[in-house]
């Protein structure tokens, strides 16, 4: 039996400078395109090689973007979120949520609070 899988959630402010080809990442999500069940948030789906985000190194695929330049991304249509990034200017401040998967307890050991059994 595997140990329980937990997630460590952290938040970070990331300041990116728009490069020659832009910010260099893709997003999924929005009220019309839920990527995570019961969550219409905006998630990073791809970081492009040699783009601004990749060169900065902090933004990761799977991160949830909470705000852009202080503007909340809650309850936005997908295209409205895309437009927000495209119109965000040269210096772009992102508030992001990283979700790090953590194995809780060794294999063969049922961790405390495991719902099974």
């Amino acid at each position: 039996m595997n140990g329980r899988v937990d997630y460590l959630v952290t938040e970070e402010e990331i300041n990116l400078t728009r490069g020659p080809s832009g910010l260099g990442f893709n997003i999924v999500g929005g009220t019309d395109q839920q990527y995570v069940s019961n969550d219409s948030g905006i998630y990073v789906s791809r970081i492009k090689e040699n783009g601004a985000a990749a060169l900065d190194g902090r933004l990761q695929e799977g991160d949830k973007i909470l705000s852009v330049n202080g503007q909340d991304l809650k309850n936005l249509l997908h295209q409205d979120a895309v437009d927000l990034f495209r119109n965000a200017g040269y210096a772009v401040s992102l508030r992001v949520q990283h979700r790090l998967q953590v194995q809780n307890g060794p294999i063969g050991h049922r961790g405390e609070g495991d719902p099974s059994g």
Epitope: L23, G24, N26, Q33, R46, H78, V82
Partner: nanobody, 125 residues
């Protein structure tokens, strides 16, 4: 492994029609942008049409009203129906896929794509 396979090209008379298909494997089309691009001999690859990750279609001006892009997520296939074909439509047609929407450019920009097919030849003559 992600793979895109185009089919359906061939030799067509001017004014004729053809439908090219792009079948994807290794991923499901939901959340993906899919683009059709073409490259004529001696020319750069150019965007023709694309459908973004929420299903909106885009066309380059030269094909508006003649070409129609559609997707069938259940069959993991994207189609490009090409009508009223002209000799200048002769090219190798490629499909490309990318996960999500680029925050930098529309899906007609070939630099946004991570995955490409091998192409199918369409000759209008």
């Amino acid at each position: 492994q992600v793979q895109l396979v185009e089919s359906g090209g061939g030799l067509v008379q001017p004014g004729g029609s053809v439908r090219v298909s792009c079948v994807s494997s290794g991923f499901i089309l939901d959340y993906y942008a899919i683009g059709w691009f073409r490259q004529a001999p001696g020319k750069e690859r150019e965007g023709v049409s694309c459908i973004d990750s929420v299903g909106r279609a885009y066309y380059v001006d030269s094909v508006k009203g003649r070409f129609t892009i559609s997707r069938d997520n259940a069959k993991n296939t994207v189609y490009l129906q090409m009508n009223s074909l002209k000799p200048e439509d002769t090219a190798v047609y490629y499909c490309a896929a990318d996960f999500g929407s680029s925050v930098d450019s529309t899906c007609l920009n070939n630099q946004q794509y991570g995955y490409w097919g091998q192409g199918t030849q369409v000759t209008v003559s």
